[in-house]
């Protein structure tokens, strides 16, 4: 009996035309939502003039339906038993699941000012930036609508640069009508224990963002894992959102719509400093902001963002060192709300429910030559927003899963 089930499972989780796995893999049957909470800055003037702590108030959720588009350019390679694809991006605003509209206004850090002053650190260009910032009446903070902040707006300061530069700025710009990849993953035909594991991303086995093992593309994309998952396993996966591979460990048994699943969570150790977790030494890319690699809980992904000083963390700086959150007032981290988890059906390795949570922050530093940054007396890693991307298997699919998989085993 068990051998027959194993054989059936192995056959059905292969990523090729005709299998259950393939059908759900090409276009997820799960509705995936991305909720955003924006950190609205309450005291922009005091920060700019006196280098005060930044007082933030989160506003949200603002919800978008995502991952509703089928994978594109799906191409099997029989020679190396891989399948390659592009994952198209799309987001549809869901007013009924949101506290307001895409036209709601927020006071946030001026993305272009923070980024340009970081990218161009030499004194002469900072003098030029100062002229452009003043002329465009830009400041350290700005008021932007949700739509602008997420999906892009024409920045008045960058628009003054007399050369062809990208003048559109947005945290997720460009998004709609773009795609992530190309991913090339093992289809499992020759070796089921490799199914869905990424072979290459954008044609490479490494990212070129980090040193040593930190640069590796490990595991799957977290939508599924090779079948017969054990509680003792460390599940590796790659997330292009955070420009790195990361891992999850078993936390508890969960019953999801009558299906026994394993809850795997991202442990605090994954966000620790190299002092506590030596494996993380290669995620520390500079010595000043990281206080000689002793700070933890924030990841500098500037190398992956064309030099823009983007720092990724967990929401509300969960698992981050006190020095990171010290200059920010109004944060309340808690594990239940702010950690990331994956609920994995162990026989198939399918992720049937997940909550991916992350926070986007931008570094802003004092600048002698830029008037609007002149009075700052310290560096700030400024939270802009946090997001919660969730997906849960639908009732119909859960019934099918129970009858065809877990039911047969039990």
């Amino acid at each position: 009996g068990d051998l027959l089930i194993q054989k059936t499972i192995k056959k059905q989780v292969v990523l090729e035309e005709g299998t259950i796995a393939f059908k759900n893999w090409v276009k997820t049957g799960t509705e995936v939502y991305r909720q955003f909470w924006i950190f609205d800055v309450q005291n922009p003037q005091e920060v700019m003039m006196n280098s005060s702590n930044i007082q933030v108030k989160q506003r949200g959720p603002y919800t978008y339906r995502v991952r509703f588009l089928a994978k594109e350019n799906v191409t099997q390679d029989a020679e190396d038993n891989t399948v390659s694809f592009l994952q198209p991006n799309g987001a549809i605003f869901e007013p009924s699941l949101s506290v307001g509209t895409e036209a709601d206004n927020f006071t946030v850090l001026n993305l272009a000012v923070a980024a340009a002053s970081h990218i161009y650190q030499n004194q002469f260009v900072q003098m030029i930036l100062n002229s452009l910032i003043n002329k465009s009446k830009s400041s350290m903070f700005q008021v932007r609508t949700l739509r602008e902040l997420l999906w892009g707006y024409r920045d008045p300061f960058l628009s003054l640069v007399p050369y062809p530069v990208t003048t559109t700025v947005g945290l997720f710009y460009p998004y709609n009508n773009t795609a992530d990849g190309v991913y090339k993953v093992f289809n499992g035909k020759d070796n089921i224990s490799k199914v869905a594991i990424i072979d290459t991303y954008k044609g490479k086995r490494n990212l070129s963002y980090w040193e040593s093992h930190c640069d590796m593309i490990n595991g799957t994309d977290a939508a599924s894992f090779p079948p017969f998952v054990e509680k003792s396993q460390v599940l590796q996966f790659f997330s292009s959102d955070i420009c790195r591979s990361i891992y999850a460990v078993f936390e508890s048994d969960v019953n999801l719509k009558g299906i026994p699943v394993y809850r795997f969570v991202l442990p605090s150790k994954a966000f620790a400093s190299p002092v506590e977790n030596p494996d993380n030494y290669c995620f520390c890319t500079e010595k000043i902001i990281s206080k000689n690699c002793t700070s933890y809980g924030v990841l500098d992904i500037s190398k992956c963002k064309e030099g823009r000083p983007v720092y990724i963390s967990l929401p509300h700086f969960l698992y981050a060192s006190p020095d990171v959150s010290e200059p920010i007032d109004g944060l309340n981290p808690n594990e239940e709300e702010h950690r990331t988890y994956l609920d994995i059906e162990p026989i198939t390795g399918f992720t049937l429910q997940f909550a991916k949570r992350l926070q986007v922050n931008l570094l802003v530093k004092p600048s002698e030559k830029i008037q609007v940054l002149k009075n700052l007396k310290r560096n700030y890693i400024v939270p802009i927003l946090w997001l919660n991307e969730t997906g849960t298997i639908g009732d119909e699919k859960a019934n099918m899963f129970r009858s065809q998989v877990t039911g047969k085993i039990n």
């Epitope: 452009l132 002329k135 007399p162």
Partner: antibody, heavy 117, light 107 residues
Framework: EVQLVESGGGLVQPGGSLRLSCAAS????????IHWVRQAPGKGLEWVAW????????YYADSVKGRFTISADTSKNTAYLQMNSLRAEDTAVYYC??????????WGQGTLVTVSS | DIQMTQSPSSLSASVGDRVTITCRAS??????VAWYQQKPGKAPKLLIS???SLYSGVPSRFSGSGSGTDFTLTISSLQPEDFATYYC?????????FGQGTKVEIK
């Protein structure tokens, strides 16, 4: 086509004044900012003054600070260098040059300033 | 102020020769260095910006390298029209400063 044309050079006595002009065409000077660079006879290049983009701040070499003033008339698309209290060591060919990121991609033909009694 | 020290101050070379001019900054200027060519009685012409970026219209025999404090201008195969004086310039900090120049003469 981008062009810069200097004028206003000539012979002046020590302590005298002179106003150089730099007429620009093919681009807007306020978008770029304009620099003056000089070259004494048989010598190398020396940066003199800069007016930052969009009527921004003005900056000067220590050797001319307090004596020279750079300005611009955006309606005429022309930059100026007002030179007062001229000294023998200010004798040079004066070039105006266009720059945004600090390197000079277009130069005028130069105008000779001779300070001599 | 940042000093730019060029060497040699002059050199003699023949058509077809590979010529290298070096420039040293008194402090780190990253890649914010430009190179110019000047012929007698003429204004300088931009050859290279950002230490390595060839300006449009400049022949590919000219190339720049270096970062931090040490920079090089190379002419891979000297042509008759390349006999001139060459200047480096840092565009990292004000005041903008030039090297003293390297005169390339016919051997």
């Amino acid at each position: 086509e981008v062009q810069l044309v200097e004028s206003g050079g000539g012979l002046v006595q020590p302590g005298g004044s002179l106003r150089l002009s730099c007429a620009a065409s093919g681009f807007t000077i306020s978008s770029f900012g304009i620099h003056w660079v000089r070259q004494a006879p048989g010598k190398g290049l020396e940066w003199v003054a800069w007016i930052a983009p969009y009527g921004g701040d003005t900056y000067y070499a220590d050797s001319v600070k307090g004596r020279f003033t750079i300005s611009a008339d955006t309606s005429k698309n022309t930059a100026y260098l007002q030179m007062n209290s001229l000294r023998a060591e200010d004798t040079a060919v004066y070039y105006c040059a266009r720059s945004f990121f600090g390197y000079f991609d277009y130069w005028g033909q130069g105008t000779l300033v001779t300070v001599s009694s | 102020d940042i000093q730019m020290t060029q060497s040699p101050s002059s050199l003699s070379a023949s058509v077809g020769d590979r010529v290298t001019i070096t420039c040293r900054a008194s402090q780190d200027v990253s890649n914010w260095v430009a190179w110019y060519q000047q012929k007698p009685g003429k204004a300088p012409k931009l050859l290279i910006s950002y230490a390595t970026s060839l300006y449009s219209g400049v022949p590919s025999r000219f190339s720049g390298s270096g970062s931090g404090t040490d920079f090089t201008l190379t002419i891979s195969s000297l042509q008759p029209e390349d006999f001139a004086t060459y200047y480096c310039q840092q565009h990292s900090n004000a005041p903008l400063t030039f090297g003293q120049g390297t005169k390339v003469e016919i051997k």
